[in-house]
């Protein structure tokens, strides 16, 4: 490892209504020369570490949570990893923990209220 | 880069507290990473303790959780482990690592024998 | 939790030959939440493989990762004398996180 990605996510929680749309901002500081091939980008479930939304080998890996996920892929290039939560369900309620591995890695956890 | 160093005895009593810290170099231990224990002993193989982030969250192996405590010192860029209760089944080498998915540095290790 | 088994559990070879060994979780993973590591005697594991296929820093390409569901594999197209090792895998797709028992590769 040659220094820790750092990985940025807001400190409050998210809050959004049943059915409404929910963006969790996730953000990394890409260095010079960064391209998209070199990016893990893996949101999960912060407690269980199930699998919610992926972004690897240069590709959108698709919504592992009930197709109801998807990235700002114009934004990623830039180091927006934030990630969109439609139709938010109240068992949508919890923490999600975004994780950046470019050479090396870090992570973050954002929490989802749902009112 | 990160480098990990495991400290502490390695004798602890039957029924005693095992105390093990983790010293960080090269890096910062408030960084967006999440620091664990992990053991290794001839019977059960490798396995995950827990974990903690800089805000002080944690998460535990179900099979340790009610014994186990990970704490975190900022100010002398460290982590600890606390198991408490322990049996002669809590011998093994104990590691420290980086990593919320994947393990990645490793300390080097330090074997911790219960015995009395 | 998800187990993981590993076969075999010995592997004798050759310098120079190819090592296949196999990696079975017993509940389906997405192939990006599987990770190996060798280890030596009287060392800590180092990380090899990440999201099944990804190599991490400084390991030679000859160590590759592949597979998908319940089986994987790690593949070393040509033994040096470094690679005499135990090698592990690990999964992170479920808390907690779970190793294998381990594949020893020895020198035939």
């Known amino acids: 490892p040659t220094g820790a990605v750092e990985v940025q996510v807001p400190e409050d929680p998210v809050v959004a209504l049943v059915g409404t749309d929910a963006t969790l901002r996730c953000s990394f500081s890409p260095e010079p020369g960064f391209s998209l091939a070199q990016l893990n980008l893996i949101w999960q479930l912060t407690d269980t570490k199930q699998l919610v939304h992926s972004f690897t080998e240069g590709r959108d890996q698709g919504s592992a949570y009930a197709n109801r996920t998807a990235l700002f892929p114009d934004l990623l290039a830039q180091g927006n990893a934030s990630l969109r939560l439609q139709r938010v369900r109240v068992a949508d309620e919890g923490s999600f923990t975004c994780f950046v591995s470019i050479r090396d890695f870090g992570s973050a956890a954002v929490s989802l209220q749902v009112a | 880069q990160v480098q990990l160093q495991e400290s502490g005895p390695g004798l602890v009593k039957p029924s005693g507290t095992l105390s093990l810290t983790c010293a960080v170099s090269g890096g910062s231990i408030s960084t967006s990473n999440y620091w664990n224990w992990v053991r290794q002993s001839p019977g059960k193989g490798l396995e995950w303790i827990g974990e903690i982030y800089p805000t002080g969250n944690t998460n535990y192996s179900p099979s340790l959780k009610s014994r186990v405590t990970i704490s975190i010192d900022k100010s002398k860029n460290q982590f600890s482990l606390k198991l408490n209760s322990v049996t002669a089944a809590d011998t093994a080498v104990y590691y420290c690592a980086r990593g919320y998915n994947w393990f990645d540095p490793w300390g080097q290790g330090t074997l911790v024998t219960v015995s009395s | 939790e998800i187990v993981l088994t590993q076969s075999p559990g010995t592997l004798s070879l050759s310098p120079g030959e190819r090592a296949t060994l196999s990696c079975r979780t017993s509940?389906?993973?997405?192939?990006?939440?599987l990770a190996w590591y060798q280890q030596k005697p009287g060392q800590a594991p180092r990380l090899l493989i990440y999201?099944?296929?990804s190599r991490a820093t400084g390991i030679p390409d000859r160590f590759s990762g592949s597979g998908s569901g319940t089986d994987f594999t790690l593949s070393i197209s040509r033994l040096e004398p470094e690679d005499f090792a135990v090698y592990y895998c690990?999964?992170?797709?479920?808390?907690?996180?779970?190793f294998g028992q381990g594949t020893k590769v020895e020198i035939k």
């Open positions: 690990q999964q992170y797709g479920s808390s907690p996180r779970t």
């Open positions: 509940q389906s993973i997405n192939a990006i939440l």
């Open positions: 999201g099944a296929s």
